[in-house]
Interface confidence: medium
């Protein structure tokens, strides 16, 4: 059987390295070897590239090497396949070297901002050494922010033959680290170089954007002063344009700017001690380029009545988010402040907060909260400068079985009855909402019985027991994830009632 006719011939000129052609089929049924016939020097010369019978039989690729690689030039290529039964020739194919030239990648040596020019980076690179001197090169510059996986691209050409090249990349974000990589190709070529090694540069910073400002009002102290924990952060949705050098705070009682106090801090939180009146608080952030717009907060007087408009709130879990939704009786309120923090006694709380606008729901990715932790979530309505009564709920993003069972004891042991009491499991060990308790009890060598009660019950009277019998008992606390047994206790019912005994004694 004759070999198959070589098809799909594809050639590439690796500049100043080789001229390589490949074809199909790659494998033949019987042993096949190939010859590649080339004409070059615009048809004046010809030669042959053979696959080596011993080592490269059935290998559908062949390379022509210098010094017979001429450029610029047009080549014709024809592939002959031969086996024991005869020869099969391909069609003749035509190749313009400029169109199939592949060169080395360029080398980026600097990515820098230019003093005074905002949101721009200047990329400097060296043209590949192995590239035709006179040719125009086309480039693709790929760039992304350092923490993004998404690349953006810009294409351009460079005609000059100076080996140091530059390109100004504009319309970037301020004060942001970018990763750059560059590839190139001769203008007429269909083959790009590989990508250069990545290089990182940072755009210049700008004056700060606005701040979101919030507070936690604490109970008044014995001397009448009120601690107010102020906290602020970059406004929601504002780009990171700068590194804040510090924050200026000033505050005064309403209608009395003469009593203005000022504070400078580098923290994003500050505790003020205020009197019982209404106060106004202002915060700006600043850096070497200027100040942010002012963030304003009104601290209500101690005795001020706050409005209430949230009627109900639900927390529910989706695949990867916690969603909190609320209903309001005040359609004019369209801004809300959400606070959330773990309900843990023994740990310093990590308190978080976020502003919500034009919505009556708030979502957070589950992986931003710890599983098995109970979170307190409060939503405050905000109407212009007034903050209303919060509505609070609790949520777990993932429940587990309790890490301890209830500590149990038997009280009021009678002839046929016993009262079982147990302690609530400490918060830190619940790992979920306790939905019920199950009392397991069993007479010595007897059948086990169980009784399940609601989570708000911490005491239960067992009846219809057998007199003068030893029982073992355990209480299990259950969350949605399952239950954990508490301490096992033993007790023995009485043979005769104390009350009965006492009565006889009287007579």
């Amino acid at each position: 059987v004759l070999p198959a006719k070589p098809e799909n011939i594809s050639c590439i000129f690796y500049y100043e390295e080789n001229f390589t052609c490949t074809w199909s089929p790659e494998k033949e049924a019987s042993y096949t070897w190939y010859k590649v016939k080339r004409t070059y020097s615009y048809g004046y010369k010809s030669d042959i590239c053979s696959t080596d019978n011993s080592t490269r039989g059935n290998h559908a690729s062949c390379s022509f090497l210098p010094p017979t690689i001429t450029n610029p030039d047009n080549y014709t290529i024809q592939v002959e396949a031969q086996n024991a039964d005869g020869i099969m020739k391909s069609d003749i194919t035509y190749w313009n070297l400029d169109a199939i030239m592949k060169i080395e990648p360029p080398e980026i040596f600097s990515v820098k901002s230019v003093l005074g020019i905002k949101r721009m980076l200047q990329i400097k690179w060296i043209r590949p050494v192995l590239a035709p001197h006179s040719s125009t090169l086309k480039y693709t510059l790929r760039f992304r922010t350092i923490n993004s996986a998404y690349w953006m691209e810009v294409n351009f050409t460079k005609e000059d033959i100076d080996r140091d090249e530059t390109y100004n990349l504009t319309e970037l974000q301020a004060f942001t680290e970018y990763v750059m990589t560059l590839r190139c190709a001769p203008a007429e070529s269909m083959f790009w170089s590989g990508w250069s090694q990545e290089k990182v540069g940072t755009t210049e910073e700008e004056a700060p954007y606005g701040l979101d400002l919030w507070r936690v009002l604490k109970p008044a102290m014995v001397d009448g002063r009120r601690p107010v924990q102020l906290m602020w952060k970059k406004a929601t949705g504002a780009p990171v344009l700068e590194k804040a050098l510090g924050y200026n705070i000033w505050y005064f009682p309403e209608n009395n700017t003469n009593l203005t106090e000022t504070v400078n801090t580098t923290n994003q939180t500050h505790e003020l001690y205020l009197g019982g009146k209404t106060y106004w608080v202002y915060v700006v952030s600043y850096n070497s380029l200027g100040e942010s717009p002012v963030a304003t907060l009104r601290i209500p007087a101690l005795n001020e009545k706050t409005f209430q408009c949230i009627e109900a709130m639900q927390a529910c879990l989706t695949q990867d988010q916690l969603v909190v939704e609320w209903q309001s009786s005040a359609p004019e309120v369209d801004t809300w402040m959400v606070e959330w923090f773990p309900d843990v006694d023994s740990e310093p709380s990590s308190f978080s907060w976020e502003s919500v606008s034009q919505a009556r729901n708030w979502t957070i990715q589950k992986d931003e909260l710890k599983p098995l932790w109970c979170y307190n979530i409060s939503v405050y309505p905000v109407l212009r400068d007034r903050v209303g009564q919060p509505y609070s709920t609790q949520a777990y993003v993932q429940e587990g079985i309790p890490s301890a069972g209830p500590v149990t004891q038997a009280d009021s042991i009678g002839v046929k009855t016993v009262t079982i009491t147990w302690k609530e499991i400490p918060k830190s060990k619940r790992n979920g909402f306790i939905k019920n308790y199950t009392i397991f009890y069993q007479a010595e060598d007897g059948k086990e019985f169980s009784k399940t009660v609601n989570s708000n019950i911490l005491q239960y009277r067992l009846e219809s027991l057998t007199r003068r019998t030893s029982y073992s008992l355990q209480v299990m606390a259950s969350t949605n994830a399952g239950g954990t047994n508490g301490t096992k206790i033993n007790f023995k019912t009485l043979s005769i009632s104390h009350h009965h005994h006492h009565h006889h004694h009287h007579h």
């Epitope: 843990v344 023994s346 740990e347 310093p348 990590s350 992986d367 931003e368 909260l369 710890k370 599983p371 098995l372 932790w373 587990g400 309790p402 890490s403 301890a404 069972g405 500590v407 400490p426 830190s428 060990k429 790992n431 954990t484 047994n485 508490g486 301490t487 096992k488």
Partner: antibody, heavy 119, light 107 residues
């Protein structure tokens, strides 16, 4: 698979410092506490301290306070224990362990790093 | 800090025997006691938490009991693969402390 991978061994000189790593896979360290436990040859287990990687909050056993430093890098899901001013008494296996709550149990242990302090 | 005194230090038993290890706390730790098994050349493994609760996948021959200061860990029928060191640990108050360990060897 949920696991904590630690480097196998460290040889250090007396008086020097060492920084041990503990890389989690199969879970996010932000969602747990990472504790460190020391085990000297043929001896029991000794609690060093713990870190909450979500906020960097740490707690140390009095014996290790000031000489042990716990840190965590949530981007690489890795916790670190640095021990300074090492002596031969610090020759031991050091384990990291996952602890889901303030008071709970170590349900996943690291592979352990053997630290040898010798001149 | 709370001292956990574990006894005995060594146990030499035959396969099929019943084994009991005790742990005594220097003050009440309620039921905040955990038991771990450490096989030669391996990291410790959780067996029992909250004094009496078997961890997922732990065979039911392993049991724990106790409250306050006295705790017991039992292997009802020892098997050859139970060769290990067993530790108790309290997580009632910081610093968490461990018992000295019991080395179980099989005849």
């Amino acid at each position: 698979e949920v696991q904590l991978q630690q480097s196998v061994a460290e040889l250090v000189r007396p008086g020097a410092s060492v920084k041990l790593s503990c890389t989690a896979s199969g879970f996010n360290i932000k969602n747990t506490f990472i504790h460190w436990v020391k085990q000297r040859p043929e001896q029991g287990l000794e609690w060093i301290g713990r870190i909450d990687p979500a906020n960097g909050n740490t707690k140390y056993a009095p014996k290790f306070q000031g000489r042990a430093t716990l840190t965590a890098d949530t981007s690489s899901n890795t916790a670190y224990l640095q021990l300074s001013s090492l002596t031969s008494e610090d020759t031991a296996i050091y384990y990291c362990a996952r602890y889901y709550y303030v008071s709970s149990y170590f349900d996943v242990w690291g592979t352990g790093t053997t630290v040898t302090v010798s001149s | 800090s709370i001292v956990m005194t574990q006894t005995p230090k060594f146990l030499l038993v035959s396969a099929g025997d019943r084994v009991t290890i005790t742990c005594k706390a220097s003050q009440s730790v309620t039921n905040d006691v955990t038991w771990y098994q450490q096989k030669p050349g391996q990291s410790p493994k959780l067996l029992i938490f909250s004094a009496s609760n078997r961890y997922t996948g732990v065979p039911d021959r392993f049991t724990g009991s106790g409250y306050g200061t006295d705790f017991t860990f039992t292997i009802s029928t020892v098997q050859a693969e139970d060769l290990a060191v067993y530790f108790c640990q309290q997580d009632y108050s910081s610093p968490w402390t461990f018992g000295g360990g019991t080395k179980l060897e099989i005849k």
